[in-house]
């Protein structure tokens, strides 16, 4: 807490500039009036505050708005945002993408922290879900992001997002996340045709279930390995050594190389020896 | 406060069903799932089935022909019902919360004794 | 269905000591794409239902105290009560969430 202390004759601020950084932690506390502040936030950034000074700021703002900052003043905290709590956060109400955008700007290229965390979570809230736009922009910044929501998070997101999603933003996703992810893939990308919609779905395969991989089987898809080692175990149980060699196309001799894991290996176990021996790839059940 | 209560009959005669209601607060049930757990006296616990905030259901294969898990998300209640109970289904019934995953709250259960 | 198996199934400890409990799975509960392990811990005192101690086989539950420590990956874990207290009497139970939702037996926990 900054003591209390009059203003010096003629240091009173008329105006956010550079002649406030040679200002004591004091001086900002008493010369810089908060409404000023507030309507001239956009100036901050371009003045080379020490993070001391940032802290006097930031206290100034929290007395003129303890139940927290309007927009108009978020958008323009630039650096003043990494002194920011997550509890500062929540006090938000943030509805423009543009703001998000500014603020993610400030933490390009470090890990998601908990204030981003926090952020991104009160903005997808107040949208009630995740649209285009917005997933647009957050995997653009954290190509991870999609992959670290619950699937229940990832159930408020519409299929027309989908579009959105990268084969990347994918990698790290599980298969419960997946389970969700799927459906709204196989809905979103109903009206392409077999090869675009292959190469569209194949990302989300991991939650696809059975019938729908027989039904790939049919489209002379040429699934790759690593694909079919991401697909459900359960799903790939049932399918015939003819559905599979149809679904993996030229890939097929991958399995070979794969047959200790799941769940090639599992598969391999529930086909009859005859069968297998169809591939001519030395598979032993 | 999230808090999940539970309330069911006690006592169920042997081939009859079994209806539980789970009724929540503090929480949506379109953000997050709700499971039920059984717990057979003195010993471990057993899950049976979930519903998802979107309303999808996933049951235990071994019990899935006995059960249904259905919610009515403006009431705030879940709802399990399992059919033709016998005395190995006398057990505490758990409804818990998940976001997909682990399960962070737990209801105090329900004792269900199944007799005649 | 992936099954959990957990040693001893019992053990008694004095107040102060240093427990550790084993939950082993029959496949492995880490997802190689996010290298997380899909693996839990409940505590649950007579009378009472579980309450979530550990997630992710190692991150403590807000409001658990730090004497609890979840550890291990893959197949093979470890919950760990750093110096046990009277009132952490309770059968410890482990749960893994990476397909579909199966528990260990619980290992019960008693003070001499």
């Known amino acids: 807490e900054v003591e209390k202390t009059a203003c010096p004759s003629g240091k009173k601020a008329r105006e956010i500039d550079e002649s406030l950084i040679f200002y004591k932690k004091w001086e900002l506390e008493a010369c810089v009036d908060a409404a000023l502040l507030a309507t001239q936030m956009d100036r901050v950034n371009a003045i080379p505050f020490t993070y001391e000074q940032l802290d006097v700021l930031k206290h100034k703002l929290d007395e003129l708005y303890p139940q927290g900052y309007p927009e108009s003043v978020i958008q323009h905290l630039g650096y003043l945002f990494l002194k920011m709590s997550p509890e500062d956060i929540r006090k938000w109400n943030v509805t423009s993408l543009e703001t998000l955008k500014a603020l993610l700007e400030v933490n390009k290229g470090h890990e998601m922290s908990p204030q981003v965390a926090t952020l991104i979570d009160r903005f997808v809230k107040g949208r009630g879900q995740l649209d285009k736009d917005t997933l647009d922009t957050l995997t653009a910044f954290y190509p991870g992001y999609l992959c670290s929501l619950s699937p229940e998070e990832l159930s408020s997101v519409p299929p027309s997002s989908i579009w959105a999603v990268r084969p990347q933003d994918l990698d790290t996703c599980d298969p419960r996340q997946l389970d969700v992810l799927y459906p709204k893939a196989r809905l979103a990308f109903q009206n392409m045709n077999g090869s675009e919609y292959f190469v569209k779905i194949q990302s989300f395969l991991g939650g696809a279930p059975t019938e729908d991989l027989k039904a790939l089987s049919q489209q002379n898809v040429s699934m790759d390995l690593a694909t079919f080692m991401k697909l459900r175990t359960d799903a790939v149980l049932p399918l015939t050594v003819a559905e599979v060699q149809k679904l993996l196309g030229p890939h097929v001799e991958g399995l070979k190389a794969e047959e200790r894991h799941r769940p090639v290996r599992d598969w391999i176990l529930r086909q009859r020896q005859d069968d297998l021996d169809t591939l001519g790839l030395g598979l032993q059940g | 406060e999230v808090q999940l209560q539970q309330s069911g009959p006690g006592l169920v005669a042997p081939s009859q069903s079994l209806s539980i209601t789970c009724t929540v607060s503090g929480f949506s049930l379109s953000r997050y799932s709700v499971h039920w757990v059984r717990q057979p006296p003195g010993k471990g616990l057993e899950w049976l089935g979930m519903?998802?905030?979107?309303?999808?259901?996933d049951y235990n294969s071994a019990l899935k022909s006995r059960l249904s898990i259905s919610k009515d998300n403006s009431k705030s209640q879940v709802f399990l019902k399992m059919n033709s109970l016998q005395t190995d289904d006398t057990a505490m019934y758990y409804c818990a919360r998940s976001l997909g995953w682990y399960f962070d709250i737990w209801g105090a259960g329900t004792t269900v004794t199944v007799s005649s | 269905d992936i099954v959990m198996t957990q040693s001893p199934s019992s053990l008694a400890v004095s107040a102060g000591e240093k427990v550790t409990m084993s939950c082993k799975s029959s496949q492995s509960v880490l997802y190689s794409s996010n290298q997380k392990n899909y693996l839990a811990w409940y505590q649950q005192k007579p009378g009472q239902s579980p309450k979530l101690l550990i997630y992710w086989a190692s991150t403590r539950e807000s409001g658990v105290p730090d004497r609890f420590t979840g550890s291990g990956s893959g197949t093979d874990f470890t919950l760990t009560i750093s110096s046990v207290q009277a009132e952490d009497l309770a059968v410890y139970y482990c749960?893994?969430?990476?397909?579909?939702?199966?528990f260990g037996g619980g290992t019960k926990l008693e003070i001499k």
């Open positions: 519903i998802w905030g979107g309303g999808n259901t």
């Open positions: 749960h893994q969430y990476l397909s579909s939702w199966t």
